[in-house]
């Protein structure tokens, strides 16, 4: 779509003659007829295929034609076309004399031809005018012409329509060839896609206007590259949305079960040793002189039975002293005035003389100890049972009675409550402090998923894309376990699609 523009500049007919050789009376009142058509090697009569136009009377005999932008006698003349400009044309310009109306001479009777010119050739679209002058025996015409594109049409042949716009269907201006030039911050074939904030994650972020970064469900952070962990996840992180991967020392569905109570809470006092024993479980092993669950109680100085050979212990404020039985002396009654002749060894112990009869030593039979084999052996004094196990003397040996959840000679092994698969109907087992907890699949509930239910949170099938639905820890809540490639609280969002991709 474009316009062929013809600028008439000067016409000379000094003798005031018509084409038939007769003079005009009183002078040649001149108007022009223009016919524009497709290129013809030999110009022929017929329709003006590219358009035609007539002028009012522009002057008498010889005259200069001024530019006029409005009203009658507009100059340059406009011949609009609504097709692709072919680059070639034929143009016929006829000068006529009219005896009648100045403004619409075309309709007057008695019009006579003064002269005509015909040009055929090629013409490229452009702003520059092509000037020409045609002379014949009687007349001379000076004119120029060009082809320009109509508003919003572009390209070599004015065939490319482009209208600049700045709305949600495009944000662009038009290049000289009609291609789109996106406004800053916009991209895409139609410049309708905003360029998001630099670094905004390609899949997890999006924007509605330039330099924005809005996060898709399951993602957060200024660049939408941080996943949102499962709601209620206490001491855990995620690599994909709604995950809850526990930090070291934490366990359970929401990473709220403390597996390292010793480090996190330091419950054992007075230099005692702390041993973890399952979620929130621990045991304190006290140093000599302390007792209590947390070794917080100080024992009496005599509690460690420091007096030997039957000596009796007396507590003082910061110390103790031993009252020795006859035949013994020393701070702890450790020295004896007896010899083997005095039969000092009890419970079948055998006596050995030492230091030329000055002293003796008793060799005790099994299960007895002490200077004189006077004490029964307590094999539990070293606290050999871990994880709060109870030590029992059993004749020549001792055994550990373990707390629930532990086994082994010294109760050192943790039994998984889940090892015996207590969850029915495909429930997922979690070891917690108070025993196993089952996360039930859709349609089941109860401590062991043993109860079949018809109306639970999963019954409506809230999970998409083949995800497995779990009712969590109560039937009214559900958790969707997404298959690979999907995220979201209901697994409704595919990961890694191109921008056309919803979410």
């Amino acid at each position: 779509s474009g316009i062929f523009q013809l600028r008439l500049q000067e016409f000379a007919n000094e003798r005031g003659m018509l084409a038939n050789g007769r003079p005009c009376e009183p002078g040649c009142r001149t108007f022009f007829r223009i016919c524009l058509k497709h290129y013809q090697a030999t110009f022929s009569e017929g329709p003006c295929t590219f358009g035609n136009v007539s002028t009012p009377v522009l002057g008498t005999n010889s005259f200069v034609i001024r530019d006029k932008n409005s009203g009658s006698g507009r100059n340059p003349l406009q011949l609009p076309f609504n097709f692709t400009w072919p680059g070639t044309f034929s143009l016929n310009i006829q000068a006529w004399h009219t005896p009648g109306d100045d403004l619409r001479p075309e309709t007057s009777p008695g019009n006579s031809l003064i002269s005509q010119i015909i040009i055929q050739g090629s013409l490229a679209v452009g702003k520059n005018w092509k000037s020409d002058e045609q002379n014949n025996t009687l007349t001379r015409l000076r004119y120029s012409y060009r082809v320009v594109c109509s508003d919003n049409y572009y390209g070599d042949s004015c065939s490319r329509l482009c209208k600049k716009r700045d709305d949600h269907f495009g944000h662009y201006e038009c290049q000289p060839d009609g291609s789109l030039s996106c406004l800053p911050g916009w991209t895409g074939k139609y410049c309708d896609q905003p360029i998001c904030l630099s670094g905004c994650h390609e899949q997890n972020g999006y924007c509605s206007k330039p330099d924005e970064c809005n996060c898709r469900p399951g993602w957060q952070g200024p660049l939408c590259n941080e996943c949102i962990p499962h709601n209620g996840c206490r001491h855990g992180t995620c690599t994909i949305p709604w995950q809850c991967a526990c930090d070291e020392g934490w366990g359970g569905l929401f990473c709220d079960q403390d597996l390292n109570y010793c480090t996190h809470h330091s419950p054992c006092k007075n230099g005692s040793t702390c041993s973890n024993s399952g979620p929130r479980g621990y045991t304190c092993t006290c140093l000599p002189g302390y007792t209590g669950e947390h070794c917080e109680l100080e024992l009496s100085k005599c509690a460690s039975n420091p007096c030997r050979n039957g000596g009796s212990c007396k507590d003082h404020e910061n110390s103790y002293h031993c009252l020795c039985p006859p035949g013994y002396y020393g701070q702890h009654c450790e020295h004896s005035t007896l010899t083997c002749a005095d039969s000092p060894c009890f419970n079948g112990g055998s006596c050995r003389e030492r230091n030329q009869g000055a002293s003796y030593a008793c060799e005790c039979p099994p299960n007895f100890t002490g200077s004189n084999c006077e004490k029964k052996v307590d094999r539990c004094t070293s606290n050999p049972c871990a994880n709060g196990g109870q030590c029992l003397n059993r004749g020549p040996s001792r055994t550990c009675r373990c707390r629930p959840g532990f086994t082994g000679t010294h109760c050192e092994l943790h039994i998984s409550d889940c090892a015996r698969s207590p969850c029915a109907h495909g429930g997922t087992c979690h070891d917690l402090e108070n025993g196993p907890v089952c996360t039930c699949p859709a349609g089941f509930s109860g401590r062991r998923c043993e109860v079949r239910i018809t109306n639970d949170a999963c019954a409506s099938g809230p999970c998409f894309n083949g995800a497995t639905c779990y009712t969590g820890l109560s039937p009214n809540n559900f958790v969707c376990n997404c298959p690979y490639g999907f995220v979201g609280s209901r697994c409704e969002f595919p990961v890694g699609l191109p921008p056309s991709f919803p979410w």
Partner: antibody, heavy 121, light 106 residues
């Protein structure tokens, strides 16, 4: 072939909120080439554009209705919805949902069959 | 607000040409679309981007747009073309419809 289907109550009381849903089938509402619009036509009158929405949630509203209109999208259900609050008898119309194509420079090539909503007590 | 003005009605004899105009300020600088709506039916897009026809729309429908006026032309009008016709354009981010023209085939 893409199809759009409006649904919602045919009768709403004055001062209440009109709620309609458009379900798209045969194509994804999440394509980057389309906006999804609502247009209404009072009985015996012409078409009036209400507003439109992109799959990301960006919305554009007719300034004359903006204070009362909310359009939302649910990509997981391939649906978009219209809420028009504080309705009066002047809001009685056939409500159409339509697809506006970026490639067609905003022309609407697919329309729902329309649903008549009457505002009356 | 931006307005598009259409004549309320246009009458045409079968086989003749019907021209429907749509006027708006500098409408030629916007893309115009045209919709046909028959009684009891949804509108149908017949022209987009001033002069382009969607697939399935007969060649007798054509469009132009320049200055302040867009025109829908139906050449060789048929009785089945009797309908209401609406022009539409976008003013920034707002869709604007013309008031509609009833085309009657005599």
């Amino acid at each position: 072939e893409v199809q759009l289907q409006e649904s919602g109550p045919g009768l709403v009381k004055p001062s209440e909120t009109l709620s309609l849903t458009c379900t798209v089938s045969g194509g994804s509402i999440s394509s980057s080439s389309y906006y999804w619009g609502w247009i209404r036509q009072p009985p015996g009158k012409g078409l009036e554009w209400i507003g439109d929405i992109y799959y990301t949630g960006s919305t554009y509203y007719n300034p004359s209705l903006k204070s009362r209109v909310t359009i939302s999208v649910d990509t997981s259900k391939n649906q978009f919805s219209l809420k028009l609050s504080s309705v009066t008898a002047a809001d009685t119309a056939v409500y159409y949902c339509a697809r506006e194509d970026v490639i067609l420079r905003g022309g609407s090539d697919y329309w729902g069959q329309g649903t008549l909503v009457t505002v009356s007590s | 607000s931006y307005e598009l003005t259409q004549p309320p009605s246009v009458s045409v004899s079968p086989g003749q040409t019907a021209s429907i105009t749509c006027s708006g300020q500098r409408l030629g600088d916007k893309y115009a679309s045209w919709y046909q709506q028959k009684p009891g039916q949804s509108p149908v897009l017949v022209i987009y981007e001033d002069s382009k026809r969607p697939s399935g729309i007969p060649e007798r429908f054509s469009g132009s747009n320049s200055g302040d006026t867009a025109t829908l032309t139906i050449s060789g009008t048929q009785p089945m073309d009797e309908a209401d016709y609406y022009c539409q354009a976008w003013d920034r981010d707002t869709g604007v419809f013309g008031y509609g023209t009833r085309v009657t085939v005599l």
